[in-house]
Interface confidence: low
Amino acid sequence: QLPPGKPEIFKCRSPNKETFTCWWRPGTDGGLPTNYSLTYHREGETLMHECPDYITGGPNSCHFGKQYTSMWRTYVMMVNATNQMGSSFSDELYVDVTYIVQPDPPLELTVEVKQPEDRKPYLWMKWSPPTLIDLKTGWFTLLYEIRLKPEKAAEWETHFAGQQTEFKILSLHPGQKYLVQVRCKPDHGYWSAWSPATFIQIPSDFIMND
């Protein structure tokens, strides 16, 4: 029977910079029941606080609700593991909410085949930013990535759309049914999950771009 092994805070994420959650990995349990607590202070303050919510984020997590989330302060946090034989502490983790945002996927992805008379046909897609994201106050730029593939294909073709919320693709296989998805990330944060797939049938007379 031993003191617990050193825990590790391995991930913190915010959906919208208004709340965030951090997760830790326990170390070895030393063969005894082990209690975990997360404590934190805001940089520039000396007052230590305990995690306000161990429930919302699931096991081995700490959730910071709106009233505990400050956009403009760095959080310094650590996890304490304790059993009957002693304690161990994780390394301190510095968390700035600005840099841990992982938004929801973009919304309202629509895809159309455009066949102008005077030009080659193309696939046109547009989407909207996720509604939870406040695009101006806090941080400002969402970047988008599109992926598509014929329904039966194994490989995705990926296109970076920058800050645009619409995109054109010219090179497609006539007669194929394509799956199209889009995801987004703030410039300092993490990619969202891919949006639900939208399906589009490419007409058989679609002229390939040379």
């Epitope: 101006k136 106050t137 730029t141």
Partner: antibody, heavy 116, light 107 residues
Framework: EVQLVESGGGLAQPGGSLRLSCVAS????????MSWVRQAPGKGLDWVGN????????NYVDSVRGRFTISRDNAKNSLFLQMNSLRAEDTGVYYC?????????WGQGTLVTVSS | DIQMTQSPSSLSASVGDSVTITCRAS??????LDWFQQKPGKAPKSLIY???ILQGGVPSRFSGSGYGTDFTLTISSLQPEDFATYYC?????????FGPGTKVDIK
Amino acid sequence: EVQLVESGGGLAQPGGSLRLSCVASGFTFSTYWMSWVRQAPGKGLDWVGNIKQDGSEQNYVDSVRGRFTISRDNAKNSLFLQMNSLRAEDTGVYYCATLLTKGDYWGQGTLVTVSS
Amino acid sequence: DIQMTQSPSSLSASVGDSVTITCRASQDISNYLDWFQQKPGKAPKSLIYAASILQGGVPSRFSGSGYGTDFTLTISSLQPEDFATYYCRQYKTYPFTFGPGTKVDIK
């Protein structure tokens, strides 16, 4: 095309009240933060405050906090600025502005004059 | 509050000149900075957001740069319609604050 039209400006006595309105069109009003900005005659721009999409959060500059209240009615695409306990230094043109991803859009402003 | 300063406060230039306006923040604001142009009797117009990204429809002769505390707005070849007052504004933290403005007039 984004359009913002302010109204409600005019002459008010020191200590008096005014309510400014801003009607928005050309974008989905309910999905954006909105701001009020003012400009004293011949002076620079001063941010007054803003309001979150659903109206649940407002932020104000210290000089107006407790006297001014920002609100919105998303059903009517309208933004409001209730100004109480007006002072001479509140005189100026008041603009409403959208806080869009790609920069701001501004109304043409409404003039507020506080004088006895 | 974050203080924003601009220099120069005014400048005289000729059509075709290259003009640079500097904006400085009293603390680090990353690139949470906008530039606005205002003409007399008109509302401000957004030129640049996020310190360097040109607003749609703004001519490419305008450019912005900087990060942290020091920022610049450059007009590469001044046109008659560019004579105006230019403001920077930070939106890193509340209250948002504007610089005092730089008036660009005809030499």
